[in-house]
Amino acid sequence: EDPQGDAAQKTDTSHHDQDHPTFNKITPNLAEFAFSLYRQLAHQSNSTNIFFSPVSIATAFAMLSLGTKADTHDEILEGLNFNLTEIPEAQIHEGFQELLRTLNQPDSQLQLTTGNGLFLSEGLKLVDKFLEDVKKLYHSEAFTVNFGDTEEAKKQINDYVEKGTQGKIVDLVKELDRDTVFALVNYIFFKGKWERPFEVKDTEEEDFHVDQVTTVKVPMMKRLGMFNIQHCKKLSSWVLLMKYLGNATAIFFLPDEGKLQHLENELTHDIITKFLENEDRRSASLHLPKLSITGTYDLKSVLGQLGITKVFSNGADLSGVTEEAPLKLSKAVHKAVLTIDEKGTEAAGAMFLEAIPMSIPPEVKFNKPFVFLMIEQNTKSPLFMGKVVNPTQK
């Protein structure tokens, strides 16, 4: 069944103060988690694209924390940037519950598909409370599979993801160890429509400068118009905000020559909040590459760098998941897929005839490595974060 199905619609949040929803309390933590994880990935390699969903990963592990105890439990929440002396755990889970409800609204124009699957070894007796909370708070499910038959187990997991993404993500899990007893898969797929689309016929192949010596050809979208764009001295970067239909905003950061690392180090939640509050528009000639970007991460190694190690080790306390036997998380995979192209609503181009000032507008070309964030506007939460080093990288 659809993990974002009925459960997502039945959540009652009427008892909350709607002016200050609980998700507001977790948003800064999610943002700082995003930057921590980004910096960790950037530190590992400066020549590869980075792309992940902070919201999606944090949701998966906050959900997992429901079944953990002691150090295993604290490590996860601290690794996700939560300080339990400042925010009660119940509020963390309520925050995620509301966040998911907002992201999965059926009438949303946001073309976002996200899900978590927990796969446990057949024969394990699962704790009812855990299963209930996973469904109620996180709109997710736990399944039992026969990990003894690794091919069949792999097929079941991949079929679940393929079905959940309407075929957009296939073969997520490439291999499973025979001793796997507990696997977590987490996926998110997004292909939005711009509020103000680009003209497809203006897209032309141009050079993208991967580094001083490497240049690749990319289809470059172009538009002369009014943009929420500014040059930020503090970040030594051009900062462009572009709205999607359905309450999402993309923020693109184009660093000045040699300032990529400076930008990566300076990004904070407060800075992002300021950009989101600024609605000023100015004329610019924008060149932005079309992108099909995918990030696939083994979360065991990635989150290990952020201090989340115990849940993957033999000393894990997952007694909230099953009391039967010692259990550890054997595999955790995250896959994020994003397409950035010219499209908006059908015939939207005609609706946005803009008066361009006569002064010569700056030409801002995203034709070298840049960083981007995608923010869900209602919750101000970071749906995606990434770095494009080479748009042609598979």
């Epitope: 292909k191 497809v200 016929k201 897209t203 032309e204 192949e205 289809p219 192209d341 042609t392």
Partner: antibody
Framework: QVQLQQPGAELVKPGAPVKLSCKAS????????MNWVKQRPGRGLEWIGK????????HYNQKFKDKATLTVDKSSSTAFIQLSSLTSEDSAVYYC??????????WGQGTTLTVSS | DITMTQSPSSIYASLGKRVTITCKAS??????LSWFQQKPGKSPKTLIY???RLVDGVPSRFSGSGSGQDYSLTISSLEYEDMGIYYC?????????FGGGTKLEIK
């Protein structure tokens, strides 16, 4: 290096359908549109339509709307054109042509389709 | 549909000469025009897009110009390998439409 590989020739009986393929390599398949162009001997070039492999959005020349169907298989980076109810008028060379946006920039070698009993 | 009228339908020209081919659209196509070269038995090759932008690797003796409804392709100094058929294409509106072609032969 960009490559668009098309079979050299196809021989099909009148009334039957045919599905021509175009296997793309050397670039990100989902970032470029794929056009199909028909060329009959001494008759110039005709644009049939184009498809966006990322989401299968299509635009057709109305003249070919009932004749041609464009599809893609993202997993194999292959574009297809299905031609129905073939007649001798459909005998031609069919090119697949990549396009970053509007203008076609990279042409396949073409498939010569012969409709004959 | 937009009609693209190409002229002349054929040209005989000497090596080293300047050659110009024109294309007239039945309405303003906003410079969304490409030029192609096709040699016998081969697939077409894109030379120019957006009326005047040269595709990478195409010799600089080829140039495009024009706006509105009227466009031209110029070869500044004809070389032997330039023989073939030249086509224009408008991609301003669906359906895209090609000109009828200009056959260029060497005298």
């Amino acid at each position: 290096q960009v490559q668009l590989q098309q079979p050299g020739a196809e021989l099909v009986k009148p009334g039957a359908p045919v599905k021509l393929s175009c296997k793309a390599s050397g670039y990100i398949f989902t970032s470029y549109w794929m056009n199909w162009v028909k060329q009959r001997p001494g008759r110039g070039l005709e644009w049939i339509g184009k498809i966006d492999p990322s989401d299968s959005e299509t635009h057709y020349n109305q003249k070919f709307k009932d004749k041609a169907t464009l599809t893609v298989d993202k997993s194999s980076s292959t574009a297809f054109i299905q031609l129905s109810s073939l007649t001798s008028e459909d005998s031609a060379v069919y090119y697949c042509v990549r396009s970053p946006g509007g203008y076609p920039d990279w042409w396949g070698q073409g498939t010569t389709l012969t409709v004959s009993s | 549909d937009i009609t693209m009228t190409q002229s002349p339908s054929s040209i005989y020209a000497s090596l080293g000469k300047r050659v110009t081919i024109t294309c007239k659209a039945s309405q303003d196509i906003n410079s969304y025009l490409s030029w192609f070269q096709q040699k016998p038995g081969k697939s077409p090759k894109t030379l120019i897009y957006r009326a005047n932008r040269l595709v990478d690797g195409v010799p600089s003796r080829f140039s495009g110009s024009g706006s509105g409804q009227d466009y031209s392709l110029t070869i500044s100094s004809l070389e032997y390998e330039d023989m073939g058929i030249y086509y224009c294409l408008q991609y301003d509106e669906f359906p895209y439409t090609f000109g009828g072609g200009t056959k260029l032969e060497i005298k």
